[in-house]
């Protein structure tokens, strides 16, 4: 069972008085509609609260969007609705917050009557002031900021025009018509697909992929017969229709679309899809849907060029296009991902990888947990994690799994212990080692959040009844103390804390209901007095990540290196602080076969670390297409895993020869590429 709130857990003395002095209530008199909350900037304390509406709506004649601003992490709010001229802000556009600490905010308003265009409200001073700008178009999507320059904005119009602003939305220019999808790339590059004939839908598979590197002065067609495209890490992907049939294949470019290679992935038919699950500068996780409406597919992991793929996980749960997958990057430990598979018996099971998709295993059964009714053997079972799919199925799961890069090793998730995910009411489990071991943390479903880089975990029960209590832990979820934050319980809607888990403030949102009226209310609690002192050297202990067997010389080695971290001792009640930086020390490991993936034409039989030739390619010359040239590969079957830093040890031989022959895996050869200038 989960740890109780007994005397043994009385870790923080006199906490009630300390928290009571730091609990701030704010009642919002006239909030209606959907409430959205955004932090503006990092460590600024600025929060915007906006009520938005879906359009069309009957309510338009009665009300308006309300905008509130806090500059003290939610302790006090000021009504600044007059700054947006009492306009309606559309739910689907919400608040577009600028990258980094730019202080920029764009609100997209609904303008009634046959106006020429939409309207935006722009702020570049952390929402202190807004400038109203009428647009020469009606926006279809939220304004997109260039990651490199927050003055550059991109938007699609309802007429499928691609509009760009170079002065933070003051002036707009239509740089292209008939655009389906547009995305910022690196260095202020814009990628977009266009249709030639009827519409985006009608031309699917016959779209062109364009690029502009100068905000629309000049263009280059970098792909034809495009179905869709995506960006991940340093890779540009396009799914391209095959010449002869209705199947399509993934092509990949690492030079912004100048040259392309065909990815060694299965082609897919009309009803199937590809999905980039995760990508970084080293590699990509790609999901390839199975034929038919199976609800599952296969995960492949790429090499460093995004071309050669290794099968990583079969029967990966991913409902139809745009549907749900439980694929989760555990950001608190390098190389760890969690997802779900659909078993032959249609039950759903959780799998975890600690080595970036090299091997997947079930999650270890938590200590002190019983196997539930789904388990055939009452002593042998696993933990199964509820994520997006469970939430979409309206199971009693208020939150997806949570991890934070600066709260090393900590993963919090709802789960059940058995042979598969259970529809019973879940409990909350925690891992302090990145998913290797788990403990039941709280009984029943909860909202949870990490504060002060893991120094505090806060939780609130998910209940249909009003609540007035939150729980907090200063020892990574082992012991919990409860705090009554109000005498009058509220219908709880969510916990809100500043992204990045560095804050010590938590806001509890909800509403009170009395006869005929309901009022939104927030309680912001500052935990600074609970963690009275700053952490010192003695408050940290050394921890080796990915450790499974200390007797193994290479214990802790993942992707060619091991990392030791300084971690807060569970007994230390102190502040990591806003400026806390994770202290880690890497050390390089010797190479073993585990540090290599199987090269083109090779595969790994199950439970074997050796790569063997694919039977159908035995004795054939290994020739494949790379950047439009035929290459001859001399290999004994291994290629170093992307991002692997091992040195010495095993060193398989590998050589690639340019055959000086053209080949046509490229769906677009350089001579077909065209450029034009505006």
């Amino acid at each position: 069972s989960a740890p109780g709130e007994d005397e043994e857990c009385g870790r923080v003395r006199d906490f009630v008085a300390k928290l009571a002095n730091n609990t701030h209530q704010h009642v919002f008199d006239d909030l209606r509609g959907s409430v959205s909350l955004s932090w503006v900037g990092d460590s600024t304390g600025v929060i915007l609260v906006l009520t938005t509406f879906h359009v069309p709506l009957v309510i338009m004649t009665f009300g308006q969007s309300k905008l509130y601003r806090s500059e003290d992490y939610g302790k006090n709010f000021k009504d600044i609705t007059d700054l947006i001229n009492n306009t309606f802000i559309r739910t689907e556009f919400g608040m577009a917050i600028g990258p980094e600490n730019s202080g920029k905010v764009v609100l997209t308003a609904e303008v009634s009557g046959g106006s020429r265009g939409g309207r935006i409200f722009r702020s570049s001073d952390f929402a202190k002031n807004f400038v109203q700008t009428d647009l020469p178009f009606h926006p279809l999507t939220q304004m997109m900021y260039s990651p490199q320059n927050s003055d550059y904005l991109l938007a699609l119009s309802t007429e499928n025009g691609l509009w760009v602003s170079k002065n933070f939305g003051g002036k707009w220019e239509e740089i292209h018509k008939a655009v389906c999808l547009a995305k910022w790339g690196s260095d202020n590059t814009i990628f977009f697909t266009t249709y030639a004939n009827g519409s985006c839908k009608a031309d699917l598979g016959a779209l062109e992929l364009w690029r502009t590197s100068d905000l629309g002065k000049s263009f280059k067609t970098i792909g034809v017969k495009i179905y869709s495209f995506g960006l991940g890490g340093r890779f540009l992907f396009a799914s391209v229709m095959a010449d002869k049939d209705t199947t399509r294949r993934i092509h990949v470019s690492t030079d912004q679309g100048d040259t392309w290679s065909m990815a060694q992935l299965p082609s897919v038919g009309q009803e199937q899809f590809y999905s980039i699950l995760a990508a970084n500068d080293d590699m990509v996780f790609m999901h390839v849907d199975e034929p038919g409406d199976t609800g599952f597919g296969t995960i492949f992991t790429s090499d460093d060029r995004g071309i050669v793929y290794s099968k990583s996980l079969d029967r990966h749960l991913y409902t139809t296009t745009g549907g749900e997958t439980d694929f989760t990057n555990v950001t608190s430990l390098r190389g760890v991902y969690i997802t779900s598979v659909l078993s032959e018996d249609n039950s759903i099971q959780t799998m975890i990888t600690f080595d970036q998709g090299g091997r997947w295993t079930h999650l270890r059964k938590p200590e002190n947990s019983e196997c539930d009714a789904t388990a055939k053997n009452k002593n042998e079972c696993s933990l199964h994690i509820h994520a997006s799919y469970s939430i979409s199925q309206k199971l009693n799961v208020p939150m997806a799994p949570l991890s934070e890069p600066n709260a090393v090793g900590i993963v919090i998730a709802h789960g059940s212990v058995g042979d598969a995910i259970s529809v019973m009411v879940p409990d909350v489990y925690i891992s302090d080692d990145g998913g290797y071991s788990w403990t039941k943390m709280l009984e029943g479903p909860h909202y949870y959040t990490i504060l002060d880089s893991g120094g505090i975990i806060v939780a609130a029960e998910h209940s249909s009844r009003p609540i007035n209590v939150i729980k907090f832990s200063t020892d990574e979820g082992q012991c919990w103390q409860t705090y009554t934050f109000t005498r009058d319980p509220i219908y709880f809607t969510g916990l809100a804390s500043e992204p990045g888990a560095r804050s010590m403030n938590i806001s509890i949102w909800g509403f009170t209901e009395s006869f005929l009226t309901s009022q939104w209310v927030s309680y912001t609690i500052d935990f600074k007095d609970i963690l009275e002192r700053n952490c010192e050297e003695k408050d940290y202990t050394i921890w080796l990540a990915h450790s499974t067997d200390p007797e193994d010389y290479e214990d802790g080695c993942i992707l060619g290196y091991k990392e030791q971290f300084l971690r807060l001792r569970k007994s230390s009640v102190c502040q990591n602080g806003r400026d806390y930086v994770v202290t880690k020390q890497p050390s390089i490991c010797l190479c073993s076969l585990e540090d290599f993936l199987c090269d083109f034409g090779y595969y790994r039989p199950e439970n074997d670390s050796k790569c063997v030739e694919q039977p159908e390619l035995k004795g054939h010359d290994l020739e494949f297409c790379l950047y439009g040239r035929e290459e001859h590969l001399t290999t004994n079957g291994y290629r170093k895993i992307p991002g692997d830093k091992c040195q010495g040890g095993v060193n398989p031989v590998r050589e690639v020869k340019d055959l000086k022959k053209k080949c046509t895996s490229n769906f677009l050869s350089p001579e077909k590429q065209n450029s034009k200038s505006n």
């Epitope: 043994e8 202990t541 080796l544 990915h546 450790s547 214990d555 030791q564 001792r569 007994s571």
Partner: antibody, heavy 124, light 106 residues
Framework: QVQLVQSGAEVKKPGSSVKVSCKAS????????ISWVRQAPGQGLEWMGG????????NYAQKFQGRVTITADESTSTAYMELSSLRSEDTAVYYC?????????????????WGQGTTVTVSS | DIQMTQSPSTLSASVGDRVTITCRAS??????LAWYQQKPGKAPKLLIY???SLESGVPSRFSGSGSGTEFTLTISSLQPDDFATYYC????????FGGGTKVEIK
């Protein structure tokens, strides 16, 4: 089977320093922390500090901070403890001990292998 | 640093007795507690780690319990070989030992 073998007994003058060695054999020295614990005649056990050979991360009990230096040499699987500014109260048996490990935490599981102890006598 | 208080400091018992030694931490240390046995002129020997886990090779008559601040070492039936001094040790702060409990023949 892992063994820790310590250097021989030492007699030192007050104000001088002593360096005790602890050589590991039969296990993966680098993956465990080595702690140093002392025991004065007729007294209890007192932790002085420890080191993790990988990376050489050392940490010390507050009482000994500035007076003790713990090092490790991975190539010879040997840990060292040097205590300076010796006084008569430092007369004790000094033990090195391997910290047991079940997870990534180096210091949480007790000391499962001990050296035979080195007697250090401080006398003028 | 976390202080460990062991009681009693001396305990007289006979072979076959059930013996209980208590250790209290000055603040919560979760389950990060170890118990050792030491005989005169010898190095300590680990009996229990993580409050209740028995070290391999240690007889099952030794058991540990507790979490937070209160811990107990129990010898269910005292054997002639068990007369020694016992120490608790916390491992969640900078390591500290209890003062020891000497178990002697009654």
């Amino acid at each position: 089977q892992v063994q820790l073998v310590q250097s021989g007994a030492e007699v030192k003058k007050p104000g001088s320093s002593v360096k005790v060695s602890c050589k590991a054999s039969g296990g993966t020295f680098r993956n465990y922390a080595i702690s140093w614990v002392r025991q004065a005649p007729g007294q209890g056990l007192e932790w002085m500090g420890g080191i993790i050979p990988i990376g050489g991360w050392a940490n010390y009990a507050q009482k000994f901070q500035g007076r003790v230096t713990i090092t490790a040499d991975e190539s010879t699987s040997t840990a060292y403890m040097e205590l300076s500014s010796l006084r008569s109260e430092d007369t004790a048996v000094y033990y090195c001990a391997r910290q047991g490990r079940k997870t990534g935490y180096y210091y949480y599981y007790g000391m499962d292998v001990w050296g035979q102890g080195t007697t250090v006598t401080v006398s003028s | 640093d976390i202080q460990m208080t062991q009681s009693p400091s001396t305990l007289s018992a006979s072979v076959g007795d059930r013996v209980t030694i208590t250790c209290r931490a000055s603040q919560s240390i979760s389950s990060w507690l170890a118990w050792y046995q030491q005989k005169p002129g010898k190095a300590p020997k680990l009996l229990i780690y993580k409050a209740s886990s028995l070290e391999s090779g240690v007889p099952s008559r030794f058991s540990g319990s507790g979490s937070g601040t209160e811990f107990t070492l129990t010898i269910s039936s005292l054997q002639p070989d068990d007369f020694a001094t016992y120490y608790c040790q916390q491992a969640d702060g900078h390591i500290t030992f209890g003062g020891g409990t000497k178990v002697e023949i009654k």
